[in-house]
């Protein structure tokens, strides 16, 4: 079953995926596309890399990290309520059948009309930080030392599962990755 | 000492075509990228696409899709660039340029070719 | 496509002073920005690479900062040899592209 995540009407969402390059240039062509992961590539493309660029997107669909160390998580600007549904996210690992295929549930809520607590209680904020090193500047991905042989998808649900924030935390500085090569 | 040496200046009418080469020395020609900048007179600089040494990959800017060819001959350590049907608005100084991919940027470039199209 | 925006578009400035060439882009590129030096006439030359870092054989008086959108290309005690146009080019997203280019006077 899909991992979901939520987002506000006129907020950012943040679709995690990563992966580790097997060497520093040697990228693995990525797609994200609107709708559950086909057989092969992506449906509903809106955005992909290559061997070494981002050579595709659409209006709204973005990657703020650095998707030439691996993270290739989507942020999309500005959500509407039209954005809701399942997202693909396919590292297109080369040989037949090889690729990794995430597929990701975004839902979203409408705007909350009083204004937020100061004490952020929504783990959706939370999540995202979990599963990146990224701050305000470029950052080594990391492999989560502490859960060997994890993967993303697992990591994603065990988040989901740990709603109490400072577990959250705990795993905030650590990157979950798909190791290729 | 890394050098990347061009063909000489061009002269062309409207609708022709111009090949313009690039030739690698000092360095291992297919650890890198070259790509292919150009800069009309009194402008400023426009990116045209990319080729990947080693396998031939290629990617071209939208602008240039279709009238862009870019190949590369590892045996002598060259690098094309095909511009077709060519108009005066192609008349430019045309730049080779290096690229390692591990920090995507063109540390060392050509001296450049001018292409002068004209009736 | 990425557009990037330097400012100023000229600037002339005495030997010894401090410049600063800032470049905007339209979308995030996280450390992908990359500054050139072009003289009349010759093949540009790169300065810094990945937003900070500064090229082999590139004198330290150039350094560049940002991260996202805004970034900074600073000449720390301006030379007479560094008369030339300035651009930044980002290499986060097909296509590539430039600024329009900061053109450098000695006063």
């Known amino acids: 079953s899909e991992v979901e995540y939520r987002a506000e009407v006129g907020q950012n969402a943040y679709l995690p995926c990563f992966y580790t390059p097997a060497a520093p240039g040697n990228l693995v062509p990525v797609c994200w596309g609107k709708g559950a992961c086909p057989v092969f590539e992506c449906g509903n493309v809106v955005l992909r890399t290559d061997e070494r660029d981002v050579n595709y997107w659409t209006s709204r669909y973005w990657l703020n990290g650095d998707f030439r160390k691996g993270d290739v998580s989507l942020t999309i600007e500005n959500v509407t309520l039209a954005d809701s549904g399942i997202y693909c996210c396919r590292i297109q690992i080369p040989g037949i059948m090889n690729d990794e295929k995430f597929n990701l549930k975004l839902v979203i809520k409408p705007a909350k009309v009083t204004p937020a607590p100061t004490r952020q209680r929504d783990f959706t904020a939370a999540f995202p930080r979990m599963l990146t090193t990224r701050g305000h500047g470029p950052a080594e991905t990391q492999t989560l030392g502490s859960l060997p042989d994890i993967n993303l998808t697992q990591i994603s649900t065990l988040a989901n599962e740990l709603r109490d924030s400072r577990l959250a935390n705990d795993l905030r500085d650590s990157g979950a990755t798909i190791r290729i090569g | 000492e890394v050098q990347l040496v061009q063909s000489g200046a061009e002269v062309k009418k409207p609708g022709a075509s111009v090949k313009v080469s690039c030739k690698a020395s000092?360095?291992?020609?297919?650890?890198?990228?070259i790509h292919w900048v150009r800069q009309a007179p009194g402008q400023g600089l426009e990116w045209m696409g990319w080729?990947?040494?080693?396998?031939?990959?290629?990617n071209y800017a939208q602008n240039f899709q279709g009238r862009v060819t870019m190949t590369r001959d590892t045996s002598i350590r060259s690098a094309y660039m095909e511009l077709s049907n060519l108009t005066s608005d192609d008349t430019a100084v045309y730049y080779c340029?290096?690229?390692?991919?591990?920090?995507?940027?063109?540390?060392?470039w050509g001296q450049g070719t001018l292409v002068t199209v004209s009736s | 496509a990425i557009q990037l925006t330097q400012s100023p578009s000229s600037l002339s400035a005495p030997v010894g002073d401090r410049v600063t060439i800032a470049c905007r882009a339209s979308?995030?590129?996280?450390?992908?920005l990359n500054w050139y030096q072009q003289k009349s006439g010759k093949a540009p030359k790169l300065l810094i690479y990945?937003?900070?870092s500064l090229q082999s054989g590139v004198p330290s008086r150039f350094s560049g900062s940002g991260y996202g959108t805004d970034f900074t290309l600073t000449i720390g005690n301006l030379q007479p040899e560094d008369s030339a146009t300035y651009y930044c080019?980002?290499?986060?997203?097909?296509?590539?592209?430039f600024g329009q280019g900061t053109k450098v006077d000695i006063k």
């Open positions: 340029a290096r690229d390692r991919a591990t920090t995507p940027s063109f540390d060392y």
């Open positions: 000092g360095y291992t020609f297919t650890d890198y990228y």
């Open positions: 080729i990947n040494a080693n396998s031939g990959a290629t």
């Open positions: 979308q995030t590129i996280g450390h992908y």
């Open positions: 990945t937003a900070t």
């Open positions: 080019q980002q290499s986060f997203g097909i296509p590539y592209t």
